[in-house]
């Protein structure tokens, strides 16, 4: 997260760290007792490493009573996701067992009504992604509030030049932005999950390159079918 601040500890009990061989790789969001939603491209970076999900964490390194690392029983990338595009960049991870719920671990309601978030709406994005252009990684969860950007502006040639489909949404990126390591994490508007940080190799913090988020409402049928 660029230009953000440390989150209040455990105030986002849905927040997950998708880890490979014990290292944070991507963000994720607990959407059901045994399921974490993340970004499909995160699996590509995992190679053949052991994928696990950390729940109930604020600090990645320090012991915390609510922290627990779960093995992944099944990884389900969206069937239409491709390495060379950010289309359909969603991944569902089934935990080896149901998460132990509590004040620091709780699923987040996700948007099912397929309607665009009003431009200008302030939404919260959180993650353990880099906090500087130099690539500094935080130990504790960071967050930032970002205004939603209308799709027409996001589709301008100097922004994303027509690449933003109706299944994506954008948020402003003027110094405050999601960045590398935040992919797969939640964009939360009004207490509801609206978007998932896409995992392209986008420049961060440049206002002409807005953050791109996969709209979960556009994938309600797929999410429901996997969770069923």
């Amino acid at each position: 997260i660029l230009g953000g601040r440390e989150a209040e500890a455990h105030a986002r009990p849905y927040m997950a760290s998708v880890q490979v061989n014990g290292e944070h790789l991507c963000g994720g969001v607990l959407v059901a007792e045994q399921w974490v939603l993340s970004a499909a491209h995160c699996l590509e970076d995992a190679a053949d490493g052991k994928v696990q999900v950390l729940l109930g964490a604020h600090s990645l390194s320090q012991p915390e009573p609510s922290k627990r690392l779960y093995d992944v029983l099944r990884a389900v990338p969206h069937p239409d996701s491709r390495p060379d595009t950010i289309d359909h960049d969603l991944l569902l991870l089934q935990l080896s067992e149901k998460a132990t719920l509590g004040p620091a671990v709780r699923p987040l309601p996700w948007q099912r009504v397929d309607r665009d978030v009003e431009p200008g709406t302030l939404c919260d994005v959180a993650g353990w992604g880099i906090v500087s252009h130099a690539g500094r990684r935080p130990d504790r969860l960071q967050h930032v509030l970002l205004p939603v950007l209308d799709r027409a502006t996001c589709n301008r040639r100097t922004h994303h030049d027509g690449a933003i489909t109706q299944r994506m949404m954008c948020a402003e990126s003027n110094r405050r932005d999601s960045c590398k390591g935040d992919s797969g994490g939640p964009l939360v508007c009004g207490g509801v999950l609206e978007g998932v940080v896409t995992s392209g190799s986008r420049v961060c913090g440049n206002r002409k390159k807005p953050g791109i988020y996969t709209r979960v409402a556009s994938y309600a049928a797929w999410i429901d079918s996997v969770l069923a």
Epitope: D150, A152, D161
Partner: antibody
């Protein structure tokens, strides 16, 4: 299939105004800016301005700010451009073009002829 | 405004020959985001312009690979490796990095 259908040719008198239209189909109108260009006979293209269909917010080439007014009607997915105080210099083909990717999609053009 | 100067004004070629069109901008057209928004359009007689190349060297979908774009800073080139009859028309370079966006004066590709 993305289509931009422009209104028919116009013959107008000097000093008059004219409004030309660009109806979009095959995509969600509010997802892309609409741009307008002018091309006088045998000459290059000139950018007049653009408009965000979400909020109707236009921006203009300084050269055309007193000549053109851009508007949109979201309900009919139509962009329009009014040209005022017309002179023979304004005789040209006027194009609308969707922005994104680049100017990949253009209307067929509307010929405006200013003549007494 | 950024002036886009194209040369030559007219380019007579034989079918199957290579054609090369130059475009020079009056200032650098590298955008503040690091990208260069230099595009090439072909306008056939009586038609609207068609996008060929965007961001200097990227072919738009459906554009044959005999078209290629190159250049940087202020100097750009469009090459057609083997001219076909359907390639005839007026070619325009365009910059979208600075407001207002501007087109070059055009190069008419015609049969020798």
């Amino acid at each position: 299939e993305v289509q931009l259908q422009q209104s028919r040719p116009e013959l107008v008198k000097p000093g008059a105004s004219v409004k030309i239209f660009c109806k979009a189909s095959g995509y969600t109108f509010t997802d892309y800016y609409m741009n307008w260009m002018r091309q006088r006979h045998g000459e290059t293209l000139e950018w007049i301005g653009d408009i965000n269909p979400n909020n109707g917010d236009p921006s203009y080439n300084q050269k055309f700010k007193d000549k053109a007014t851009l508007t949109v009607d979201k309900s009919s997915s139509t962009a329009s451009m009014e040209l005022r105080s017309l002179t023979s210099d304004d005789s040209a083909v006027y194009y609308c073009a969707r922005e994104g990717p680049s100017f990949a999609y253009w209307g067929q053009g509307t010929l405006v002829t200013v003549s007494a | 405004d950024v002036l886009m100067t194209q040369t030559p004004l007219s380019l007579p070629v034989s079918l199957g020959e290579q054609a090369s069109i130059s475009c020079r901008s009056s200032q650098t057209i590298v955008h503040s985001n690091g990208d260069t928004y230099l595009e090439w359009y072909l306008q056939k007689p009586g038609q609207s312009p068609n996008l060929l190349i965007y961001k200097v060297s990227n072919r738009f979908s459906g554009v044959p690979d005999r078209f290629s774009g190159s250049g940087s800073g202020t100097d750009f080139t469009l090459k057609i490796s083997r001219v076909e009859a359907e390639d005839l028309g007026v070619y325009y370079c365009f910059q979208g990095s600075h407001v207002p966006p501007t087109f070059g004066g055009g190069t008419k590709l015609e049969i020798k």
